[in-house]
């Protein structure tokens, strides 16, 4: 059999090997595709499949429009003039090349030594579904899953049996100084098909600089609430990336999922202490916040005690 | 919203002519193929003739083939058929209606035109 | 010619009742069948397009299915509505064939 390949929407001929160019013609088509469970004998008088499948003059059958249901294989048994039987047959695949892919949501720079998204490059409209592959400074990047980390999802268009396809890309860039240059490309993994590549972004990689700080701001300011109320207390770092910040409560750690925010809904005589944040940096070790004090007590009560934050409601170090 | 609208039925004698027309609209009409049905009083469903999409391709059952023909204006949205050496079994009300071929089967159906053949 | 069987030709049915109409093929039409619902001096409404599928605007409680050649209609709780008369159709070959037709009826 001989393997074709058709783009969507396109037409395509096949023809029938060993048929009379002209009638009379003994000649017979069958097909087996997405629009069939088994095989369907077209008529050669031509009827309600020729929108999808025609016998033309010729023997010949033309798909005006082929589609994804057109996929499967074509078989046409002729007589030729002197009496012999001829088969042909077609295993028709179809191909839809997408629009050029882009990166969406790239980055502006990257930090040496930790993990950095590039961005996510997406292709939409393709069939098959086809790959996208990474590129730096015009090399493949092979995904290692530590250094290079690629996450990927597909799509299909449940009305256009269409494909898009989105993958991000995270590094970690070793050095700082240098200008890598990313880009993305998309293959339908089709022969004589050249890959779609995106523009290329360059992007900065800057050495990570230690957090400036860290600032612990209470609500209500000056810590000092009633019973019930509610405390929120935010640690506030500049650093990028966001460090994991864990929570000290009169200087034992508390068994919380690392959170930038601590809320205190409800409170009581028991949550009355001193309290810290702990963010810790992958490039520069743990960093704490200076102490707040939060005291309990009825409305009418004195101003801040001693030790407690002061009237802004924060503490920073430098 | 797709519309099928039928027109020019009316009292015929046995031998005579006449010209249906139907106007469609709210479809891309040289998207579809259209197709004529026909009903006689109390009976059930007929297919009368289908048309592919461009004009080029029709199609007839044996009792109407050689006397009617289907055709069709692109540009002005509009379905015809030519009914020539009508009989009296050819009486009904007559619909036009979008489709015909695998793809669509016959999906919206206009309210019909009644041709009567008779002395 | 294909011929499309279409049974029973009538049937009494109440308002709740299940109502099961069937069109048997005299060869194979694959998916390609269409359910329709005629009322009395109205046209054709298209129920169930290539066997199973429900069209735009018709209620849940029409449903198409198909077991190789015999095709089927099932309304799963007949509404004062229902009562009409329905026709199966065949768009596989010419000539487009239809069925005789099942007439509704109140009990």
């Known amino acids: 059999g001989q393997n074709i390949t058709a783009r969507i929407g396109e037409p395509l001929v096949l023809s029938c090997k060993g048929a009379p160019k002209k009638p009379p013609q003994q000649l017979e088509w069958k097909l087996n595709t997405g629009r069939t469970e088994a095989w369907k004998v077209l008529s050669p008088q031509g009827g309600p499949w020729d929108s999808v499948a025609r016998i033309l003059p010729n023997g010949s059958l033309l798909l005006p429009a082929t589609g994804i249901v057109d996929e499967g294989t074509f078989r046409c048994r002729a007589t030729n003039r002197r009496g012999k039987e001829v088969k042909s047959n077609y295993r028709v695949r179809v191909y839809q090349i997408p629009g050029k892919p882009e990166i969406v949501d790239p980055a502006s720079e990257l930090t040496a030594s930790v993990p950095n998204k590039v961005g996510t490059c997406v292709s939409e409209g393709s069939y098959p579904a086809g790959t996208l592959s990474w590129h730096l400074d015009g090399k493949l990047l092979i995904p290692d899953g530590k250094e290079t980390l690629v996450k990927e999802e597909t799509r299909r268009h449940p009305e256009t049996g269409l494909f898009t396809l989105r993958s991000e890309l995270t590094v970690i860039p070793t050095q700082g100084g240098t200008h890598p240059t990313f880009s993305c490309s998309f293959s339908l993994g089709l022969p004589r098909r050249r890959p779609l590549n995106t523009a290329p972004i360059q992007l900065r990689v800057r050495e990570p600089g230690p957090p400036e700080g860290i600032q612990l701001l209470v609500e209500p300011e000056g810590g000092i609430v009633a019973p019930g109320g509610t405390v929120t207390l935010t640690c506030a770092i500049s650093a990028q990336p966001p460090p994991q910040v864990h929570w000290i409560k009169d200087g034992a750690p508390l068994p919380l999922a690392p959170s930038p925010v601590l809320l205190l809904p409800e409170v009581g005589h028991e949550d009355e202490g001193t309290y810290s944040c702990v963010a810790t940096h992958p490039s520069h070790g743990p960093q704490e916040s200076p102490p707040v004090s939060i005291r309990v007590t009825e409305t009418g009560d004195e101003g801040p005690a001693e030790g407690s934050v002061g009237e802004s409601g924060l503490g920073t170090l430098a | 919203e797709v519309q099928l609208v039928e027109s020019g039925g009316g009292l015929v004698q046995p031998g005579g002519s006449l010209r249906l027309s139907c106007a469609a609209s709210g479809f891309t009409f040289n998207n579809y193929w259209m197709t004529w049905v026909r009903q006689a009083p109390g009976k059930g469903l007929e297919w009368v003739a289908s048309?592919?999409?461009?004009?080029?391709?029709?199609y007839y059952p044996d009792s109407v083939k050689d006397r009617f023909t289907i055709s069709r204006d692109n540009a002005k949205n509009s379905l015809y058929l030519k009914m020539n050496s009508l009989r009296a079994e050819d009486t009904a009300v007559y619909y036009c209606?979008?489709?015909?071929?695998?793809?669509?089967?016959?999906?919206?159906w206009g309210q019909g035109t009644l041709v009567t053949v008779s002395s | 010619d294909i011929q499309m069987t279409q049974s029973p030709s009538s049937l009494s049915a109440s308002v709740g009742d299940i109502v099961t109409i069937t069109c048997r093929a005299s060869?194979?039409?694959?998916?390609?069948v269409n359910w329709f619902q005629q009322k009395p001096g109205k046209a054709p409404r298209r129920l169930i397009y290539r066997a199973t599928n429900l069209a735009d605007g018709v209620p849940s409680r029409f449903s198409g299915s198909r077991s190789s050649t015999d095709f089927t209609l099932t309304i799963s709780s007949l509404q004062p509505e229902d009562f009409a008369t329905y026709y199966c159709l065949e768009f596989d070959e010419h000539p487009l064939t239809f069925g005789g037709g099942t007439k509704v009826e109140i009990k």
């Open positions: 060869q194979d039409v694959g998916i390609y």
């Open positions: 048309i592919d999409n461009s004009g080029d391709n029709t």
């Open positions: 209606t979008r489709g015909g071929d695998i793809t669509t089967g016959l999906d919206y």
